[in-house]
Interface confidence: low
């Protein structure tokens, strides 16, 4: 579902996208345009993600710009005022609504904006078990920018003697290059165990661009929690598991 | 050994209000997703909240509103504030680790509410 | 929200009798459904988690198996200790809902 009206009351029932009118060709000068996203459950939250196609005039956001409030209308609390060509972060509100407004002026013009919507998911609902015999994990929204305030856990579960494969096809996290006194990824990262989460031995915990490489579990359980913070936001990964079936003797279980 | 103890159940009025605490032990109660689950007398299971590790909350649509669910980490304990409660809300209140799934239950406080 | 349909609702059956019981999801929950087992005046214990693991310290007797929407927990030797009542649940999304529960009882 795509929208190029000029506003518009978007109540969601499933992901789609708003634009500026006429993207991805020029917007119309001394347009006023707003939109309100509501989600259907008043306990729900809205995450919004901008097309990396980002074009508004760029002169200190005093003449084009976009503007994002947490709330239903202007007197919402500002999220943030935008424009140029580079396309803002994730926005995720604290309630069920978002309120966004786009002003050109009436001269120079870009292609404008295109912006996804869709209901924030988070804990229960970004967390997945896994029992096939091989899959694909990835972080939520990937390729696309992750969300901020994520408690995703993923669980490969696989019959007891058997072997499990874990290997990265993409790994992309905000970095932590100067950690104090020997703690590293303290914004986001991706924690690995085989096992249960705090339970079973820790493999590794990781952020930035050093990929974990090739991971091996064999106690059946392999778990990875991704948590990321209130702010940057990076690509995310993409991981392969299989499942290898153990050689050991059924008579040893 | 992992030990979950409710307590804070009784007799309340209704439109009244309680507090019920579950106690942890045996585990590093920081790591773990806790839930409150409800058992009306002579009925099944009924799912009431959750909350994640970080905070996080979730709610059955019947106590959206009224009821409060939180932690205090420093006393390993999960805590469910029950306002403006109704008779319909006579039940066992059980505290549930969430591991694989509601993996540790404790033996459960009994909420009665009537006039 | 998801409905979860348990039947049957009770079974007599005796010791040493193979036990199973369905639960139906109102629409596919992948292998998001867990078994518990209650006896009277007691809390519940988790049986089979992610459809058909069998959680820690529960006897080999007690199976769990399906996807998506049809679930199965089987007790292929029943004993004298099974006799209580058992509920399947899906995590696979809020609000979490639970079948209404099978009451296994002595034949």
């Known amino acids: 579902f795509r929208n190029d009206k000029c506003g518009d009351t978007i109540k969601i029932e499933s992901p789609g996208y708003l634009t500026s009118p006429g993207y991805p060709h020029s917007y119309h000068p001394s347009e006023k345009c707003e939109w309100l996203i509501q989600a259907p459950d008043p306990y729900q939250r809205i995450m919004i993600n901008f097309n990396p196609h980002f074009d508004l005039e760029d002169r200190d956001c005093k003449y084009d710009y976009v503007e994002v409030f947490d709330g239903e209308n202007e007197n919402g609390h500002f999220r943030g005022k935008f424009c140029g060509k580079i396309a803002p972060p994730p926005v995720v509100s604290s309630g069920p609504f978002l309120f966004i407004k786009f002003v050109s002026d009436y001269e120079t013009h870009g292609a404008g904006f295109s912006i996804r919507y869709e209901i924030f998911k988070r804990g229960p609902e970004c967390s997945q078990n896994y029992t096939t015999p091989s899959g694909v994990i990835k972080s939520p929204g990937f390729p696309e920018k992750y969300p901020n305030s994520l408690e995703c856990t993923y669980i490969v579960f696989v019959p007891k003697m058997s072997e499990i494969i874990l290997e990265f096809e993409s790994f992309d996290l905000e970095p932590d290059s100067n950690p104090p006194g020997g703690m590293f990824c303290r914004y986001d990262r991706l924690e690995i165990w085989d096992g249960f989460p705090d339970v079973g031995p820790h493999i590794g915990r990781y952020c930035g661009q050093k990929t974990p490489g090739r991971i091996r579990s064999s106690s059946g359980i392999l778990s990875m929690v991704f948590y990321t913070d209130s702010a940057i936001a990076k690509e995310g990964f993409s991981a392969n598991y299989s499942v290898l079936q153990s050689s050991v003797s059924e008579d040893f279980k | 050994e992992v030990q979950l103890l409710e307590s804070g159940g009784g007799l309340v009025k209704p439109g009244g209000s309680l507090r019920l605490s579950c106690a942890a032990s045996?585990?590093?109660?920081?790591?773990?997703?806790m839930s409150w689950v409800r058992q009306a007398p002579g009925k099944g299971l009924e799912w009431v909240s959750s909350?994640?590790?970080?905070?996080?909350?979730y709610y059955a649509e019947s106590v959206k509103g009224r009821f409060t669910i939180s932690r205090d980490e420093s006393k390993q304990t999960l805590y469910l504030q029950m306002q403006s409660l109704k008779t319909e809300d006579t039940a066992v209140y059980y505290c549930?680790?969430?591991?694989?799934?509601?993996?540790?239950w404790g033996q459960g406080t009994l909420v009665t509410v009537s006039s | 929200d998801i409905q979860m349909t348990q039947s049957p609702s009770s079974l007599s059956a005796s010791v040493g009798d193979r036990v199973t019981i369905t639960c139906r999801a109102s629409?596919?929950?992948?292998?998001?459904l867990n078994w518990y087992q209650q006896k009277p005046g007691k809390a519940p214990k988790l049986l089979i988690y992610?459809?058909?693991s069998l959680q820690s310290g529960v006897p080999s007797r007690f199976s769990g198996s399906g996807s998506g929407t049809d679930f199965t927990l089987t007790i292929s030797s029943l004993q004298p200790e099974d006799f209580a009542t058992y509920y399947c649940?899906?995590?696979?999304?809020?609000?979490?809902?639970f079948g209404g529960g099978t009451k296994v009882e002595i034949k």
């Open positions: 629409q596919s929950i992948s292998s998001y």
């Open positions: 992610a459809a058909s």
């Open positions: 549930a680790r969430v591991g694989t799934a509601f993996d540790y």
């Open positions: 649940q899906q995590s696979y999304s809020t609000p979490l809902t």
């Open positions: 909350i994640s590790r970080t905070g996080y909350t």
């Open positions: 045996g585990f590093t109660f920081s790591s773990y997703a």
